[in-house]
């Protein structure tokens, strides 16, 4: 599949017409700025409840805050899925759901949101100072992953506040998706904008070419956008505070009782909201991760509907694995 | 190729216990988890559980927890289940079954291992 | 638990015959459905996965439909050796269960 972006050609100012386009020289700058500060940053939320009638029974439960479909929800305890941390649960939206010790029950909530109860007692069970993480794997925005744990000091029954995740990692779908639009859109306004410093009138030339998008290819992405995308993996304690009530989630996000709407009705925060963000709650995780999408397995694919993508660079059946198999 | 090659028929006492394997080949054994399915005679099937050999997970039917135990032994590629507390209704064939966690389903089964509990 | 609802308990057809066997559940399972095949004195086969896809080397007269509820494998110009059990199952929550069976008699 090939996605290319077609920028129409600007065309040369017409004589005496020159104060009209330095006017709309100011707006455009601004247009792409509002675009690229309001362009959607998907988050996670997570939200870990120890259940009141069993002391180490848990419930987490987990949301995306998203425009794009989910394709795969990987529940995680101990750390990341694929940094030490061990798969509690497997879900996809369409073929169901796999799940481990002491999961006992996983399931869809809504459309982009999921819950799991977890066995209270054997060797496996949770302790309250337990990491559990969330990383929904979606398109077009990639993998997004966001960890969170009981506060120290909870109360049976009560629950640490949803954890927001201003999570920085993009896949190649994402990245050469629809960022990609908007990168180049906020380039062209940094270039915009220093011309304009330089020259107070600009007069713009007429383009020869039409600029494409980089041609996103989801199984085999070409060395020069690895290269270009590789960020190493990083996983930041955030343990700077003990959880309170106001660590809530940016959104206002979802109470205990209430559930998400099927459909988020909200864009999802942008990055200039980032620096608002409450900072996680105790024991919570900000993974920031570049997964290229990798070929997944040696077998060839299968054909037929519902044949998923998975967006995690180590392919899908790391899924199954404390580390991630193969 | 790859093989689910599971140990012979069974016949054992009431109350007694025992061990079924159901050893891999032809595959990496640590890529897929392996689920293990009840069929007892002229019925339908029913699902036991799965366990994870890359780290010993375990997932369970709650109608089996108390009676099976999944295990497996990397080195030799094997996965185990053993049933304890055996009575009549246990009588059945045993089938483990290599899930396959790209497209979500049973894509190779074992022979299957009778088991028999007479007095 | 979501109880796998297979009706026809026993399917009589002909060699060269369309035949469908038919799987219910008993709530919204989306595409979370698999087929199987069992042969006399065999052990399950692979038929479906996610309610439509076909298993490496599955002929392609078995197809199948459906999606939430209501699941259907079709079976067009049947032959000899499709005599069998045929099993559904949903994988959409726990514990999986399957179908109680549906028997293909060959005429």
């Known amino acids: 599949m090939r996605t290319e972006a077609q920028v129409p050609a600007l065309q040369p100012p017409e004589p005496g017409l020159e104060g009209a386009m330095g006017h709309r020289t100011l707006v455009l700058p601004w247009v792409l700025l509002t675009l690229c500060v309001t362009a959607g940053t998907p988050e996670v939320w997570v939200q870990v409840r120890m259940e009141a009638t069993e002391l180490s029974s848990f419930t987490i439960r987990c949301g995306f805050l998203g425009s794009g479909s989910i394709s795969l929800v990987t529940v995680s305890w101990g750390g990341p899925n694929g940094a030490g941390g061990t798969t509690l649960a497997v879900l996809h939206p369409e073929r169901g759901i796999r799940q481990w010790a002491p999961a006992r029950q996983a399931r869809w909530e809504t459309q982009s949101s999921i819950s799991l109860i977890l066995e209270g007692s054997g060797a496996s069970s949770p302790c309250a100072n337990t990491t559990f993480c969330c990383k929904f794997a979606s398109f077009p925005e990639g993998s997004w992953e966001a960890c969170g744990s009981l506060p120290p000091s909870s109360d049976p029954g009560l629950s640490a506040p949803p954890t927001p995740a201003p999570i920085l990692r993009a896949d190649l779908a994402g990245i050469l998706g629809v960022s990609g639009v908007l990168l180049f859109g906020c380039v062209y306004l940094l270039h915009l904008l220093r011309r304009h410093k330089h020259r107070p009138a600009p007069r713009l030339q007429p383009s020869r070419t039409s600029p494409q998008a980089p041609r996103a290819r989801a199984w085999a992405p070409s060395q020069a956008s690895q290269a270009a995308l590789h960020v190493p993996y990083a996983t930041i304690n955030t343990s700077c505070r003990p959880a309170t009530l106001d660590t809530a989630h940016p959104h206002g996000g979802p109470s205990w009782w209430a559930s998400l709407p099927t459909h988020a009705a909200h864009r999802p925060q942008g990055p200039a909201a980032w620096a608002s963000t409450p900072i996680p709650a105790r024991g919570s995780f900000v993974s920031v991760e570049n997964g290229l999408y990798a070929q997944a397995g040696e077998r060839p694919p299968h054909t037929g509907p519902g044949l998923t993508l998975f967006p995690d660079p180590r392919g899908p059946r790391a899924m199954e694995g404390p580390l991630g198999v193969r | 190729e790859v093989q689910l090659q599971q140990s012979g028929p069974e016949l054992v006492k009431p109350g007694s216990s025992m061990k079924i394997s159901c050893k891999a080949s032809g595959y990496t054994f640590t890529d897929y988890s392996m689920d293990w399915v009840k069929q007892s005679h002229g019925k339908s099937l029913e699902w036991i559980g799965a366990i994870n050999p890359n780290n010993g997970g375990t997932s369970y039917n709650q109608k089996f927890k108390d009676k099976a135990t999944l295990t497996v032994d990397r080195s030799s590629s094997t996965a185990y289940m053993e049933l304890r507390s055996l009575t009549s209704e246990d009588s059945a064939v045993y089938y483990c079954?290599?899930?396959?966690?790209?497209?979500?389903?049973?894509?190779?089964w074992a022979t299957g291992t009778t088991v028999t509990v007479s007095s | 638990d979501i109880v796998m609802t297979q009706s026809q308990k026993f399917m009589s057809t002909s060699v060269g015959d369309r035949v469908s066997i038919t799987c219910k559940a008993s709530?919204?399972?989306?595409?979370?459905v698999d087929w199987y095949q069992q042969k006399p004195g065999q052990s399950p086969k692979a038929l479906i996965y996610?309610?439509?896809n076909r298993h490496t080397g599955v002929p392609d007269r078995f197809t199948g439909s459906g999606s939430g509820t209501d699941f259907t494998l079709t079976i067009s110009n049947v032959q000899s050796e499709d005599l069998a059990d045929y099993f559904c199952?949903?994988?959409?929550?726990?514990?999986?269960?399957f179908g109680g069976g549906t028997k293909l008699e060959i005429k």
């Open positions: 199952l949903q994988h959409w929550n726990y514990p999986y269960t």
């Open positions: 079954a290599r899930w396959d966690s790209d497209y979500w389903y049973f894509d190779v």
């Open positions: 996610s309610a439509s």
């Open positions: 709530q919204n399972v989306r595409t979370a």
